[in-house]
């Protein structure tokens, strides 16, 4: 039902849920200490503008007893809960940064008259997309399918000759929710994915994906799979793996394979990392010093969406426009604000836009080096390294059908 | 609007090294790639190589491998090129230039080296 | 490496007539083609990447097209501040830059 908003009057309030089933498990008091960084900052653009306003967030907490997995698997109804708290409390705000597990954000986006806008940390399943008032700040399954079908088809690069159309697709079900999401999308039969791809079959089983490492038999020689590296040894260990075999790693949230002293461990040498590229600066501000490079991205895109509802808040104060009103929580799309780390854009779903960055191991360095950057606001590939020391034979990608590798 | 600024004109001996900078103002820095393209006297333009300063490593022009080191400073949004085992060939005006990967849009004014005896 | 050839070397033109100039890679590059202009004494200038598309602040006489290894940028009607050096360039490989065609005043 309809609930009045604090939302006028010169002051505005931002409505903060912080749940006990969230996508990354980050201690709650990490998220708070983002949020009341990105309320410093916006107070003070909005002072810097002349605006003198006030903006607070309110944290809304569940009831941990009913909701304690920890995990997403029961966030579905914690999210309605939260929302039927607030509205018995009349305490909504102008806007909603919360749910971050894509069961919750789909049930409350379904099951609620949304004349408010949603932002969320996370959210990353192919049911979230297109949603008119809902912003999402770390990449969507969709910007990852995007890429992976543009990866498949280019064949006019130095070190990629061939189209590919074949895919496995190791998912064994103990994923994390953003590798779920991204995963659900590669398997799903009506994905853009599945549509672009003549093979794609999904290994369940440890042993599948163990098997087809060394099986002359194999359909392709491309396995998708998401997770770091330890993930990646605790299956594959030292076992030996077929020359024209490329395993791509996706592990979108972690800074680490930029850092100066990491050397690629010996099982790498047939992966291919899909990551994100890295911030401008490493986050040295009160609520960054207790995080992980993983958990750094769900912290930021907390403090990030304050600041996108401080950029929001600036533009329709600066015409006079009403914040409580339908076009308001429609307008947090198709822009670019100041983001903590430089610019964030945000297509026109209100999805973020980023730097998507494949790494591969370098045979004589044994580092992490850039192969090629794709943009998800253009869906373009840009290489970087044009004579990549790989493993593969002529320092070129094979073919993804056994057979007919590198001519 | 993003300006490159180089360091001034070097004279050098043969077997020295020559480390030439670039700082860049009023624009990003750290996402796009910073290359290094020199010019010999009445010549055509020779790319060195390039770095992107967010990822920290560079690539080479294969002519240039093993003598030439590409570096970047994110904190102060400069760029570097250092040049080693210097000979008179290597007489020439040395730019850099930011660019989105390897098509260059933003020139610095260049950098005068002379190499001699 | 992919060795690029532009012809002429030399083009002699009057103020006010059009100007074309052709850049051949020795493989296809696709569209990653750049062409800029230099004048004595100064840096370089992008005028057109992708084969095609002008840089920002690029006047409208300047067009760029082909794809593959046969490139052509034409100049419609040549101003005075025109007459210069262009360079073609390729970036699907590592860089490599044209020889440069002279475009003085006939």
């Known amino acids: 039902s309809q609930v009045s908003q604090n939302c006028h009057n010169g002051s505005y309030e931002i409505s903060v849920l912080m749940m006990g089933n969230s996508a990354f498990a980050e201690p709650l008091k990490n998220l708070e200490d983002a949020v009341n960084e990105g309320l410093e900052i916006v107070r003070g653009r909005l002072q810097n503008a002349g605006l003198n306003v006030t903006v607070n967030a309110t944290f809304m907490y569940s009831d941990g007893l009913i909701h304690n997995s920890g995990d997403c698997r029961s966030s579905t109804c914690e999210g309605l809960d939260l929302l039927r708290k607030i509205s018995n409390a009349q305490r909504m705000g102008c806007v909603l940064i919360g749910p971050s597990c894509t069961y919750s954000t789909f049930q409350m986006y379904l099951d609620t008259e949304l004349s408010y806008p949603m932002i969320s940390a996370g959210s990353f399943g192919l049911s979230c997309d297109y949603k008119e008032t809902l912003t999402r700040l770390m990449s969507p399954a969709r910007k990852l399918m995007y890429f992976l079908v543009n990866f498949w088809k280019t064949n006019d690069l130095p070190f990629k000759t061939y189209s590919w159309s074949t895919s496995y697709v190791y998912k064994n079900g103990t994923e994390t929710e953003d590798c779920f999401w991204y995963l659900n999308a590669l398997e799903a039969s009506v994905s853009y994915f599945s549509h672009e791809l003549g093979f794609k079959v999904v290994l369940r089983q440890d042993k599948e994906f163990q098997d087809i490492l060394m099986d002359h038999n194999r359909k392709s020689n491309v396995i998708i799979m998401c997770g770091g590296p330890e993930f990646l040894y605790k299956l594959k260990g030292d076992r030996a793996v077929a020359e024209d075999i490329v395993i791509i790693l996706v592990d979108l949230f972690n800074d680490q394979y930029f850092e100066d002293n990491v050397t690629a461990p010996d099982y790498m040498k047939n992966v291919l990392v899909l990551t994100l590229s890295p911030g401008n600066s490493l986050l040295n501000s009160s609520f960054s010093r207790n995080l992980s490079p993983t958990k750094r991205d769900f912290a930021l895109a907390y403090l990030n969406g304050i600041l996108l509802f401080g950029h929001m808040l600036k533009i329709f104060l600066e015409n006079g426009e009403n914040i409580t009103t339908p076009k308001f929580a429609h307008a947090f799309r198709n822009l670019t604000f100041e983001g903590y780390d430089g610019p964030v854009t945000l297509d026109d779903w209100g999805d973020v836009d980023s730097t998507m960055v494949l790494l591969y191991t370098s045979v004589d360095t044994k580092k992490y080096k850039v192969l090629l950057t794709y943009d998800t606001h253009v869906n373009k590939t840009y290489p970087v390294d044009m004579s990549p020391t790989f493993t593969w034979k002529n320092s070129k990608l094979p073919n993804d059908i056994t057979g007919r590798g590198p001519q | 609007e993003v300006q490159l600024v180089q360091s001034g004109a070097e004279v050098k001996k043969p077997g020295s090294s020559v480390k030439v900078s670039c700082k860049a103002s009023?624009?990003?820095?750290?996402?796009?790639?910073i290359s290094w393209v020199r010019q010999a006297p009445g010549q055509g333009l020779e790319w060195m190589g390039g770095?992107?300063?967010?990822?920290?490593?560079?690539n080479y022009a294969q002519k240039f491998q093993g003598r030439v080191t590409i570096t970047a400073d994110k904190s102060t949004s400069t760029a570097y090129m250092e040049l080693s085992s210097l000979r008179s060939e290597d007489t020439a005006v040395y730019y850099c230039?930011?660019?989105?990967?390897?098509?260059?849009?933003?020139w610095g004014q260049g950098t005068t080296v002379t190499v001699s005896s | 490496d992919i060795v690029m050839t532009q012809s002429p070397a030399t083009l002699s033109v009057s103020p006010g007539e059009g100007a074309t100039l052709s850049c051949r890679a020795s493989?296809?590059?696709?569209?990653?083609l750049a062409w800029y202009q230099q004048k004595p004494g100064r840096a370089p200038r992008l005028l057109i990447y992708?084969?095609?598309t002008r840089a920002t602040g690029i006047p409208a006489r300047f067009s760029g097209s082909g794809s593959g290894t046969e490139f052509t940028l034409t100049i419609s009607s040549l101003q005075s501040e025109d007459f210069a050096v262009y360079y073609c360039?390729?970036?699907?490989?590592?860089?490599?830059f044209g020889g440069g065609t002279k475009l003085e005043i006939k």
């Open positions: 230039a930011r660019g989105h990967y390897y098509y260059m849009d933003v």
């Open positions: 009023g624009g990003t820095f750290s996402s796009y790639a």
């Open positions: 770095i992107i300063p967010i990822f920290g490593t560079a």
């Open positions: 493989q296809s590059v696709s569209s990653n």
């Open positions: 992708g084969a095609s």
């Open positions: 360039q390729q970036y699907n490989n590592w860089p490599s």
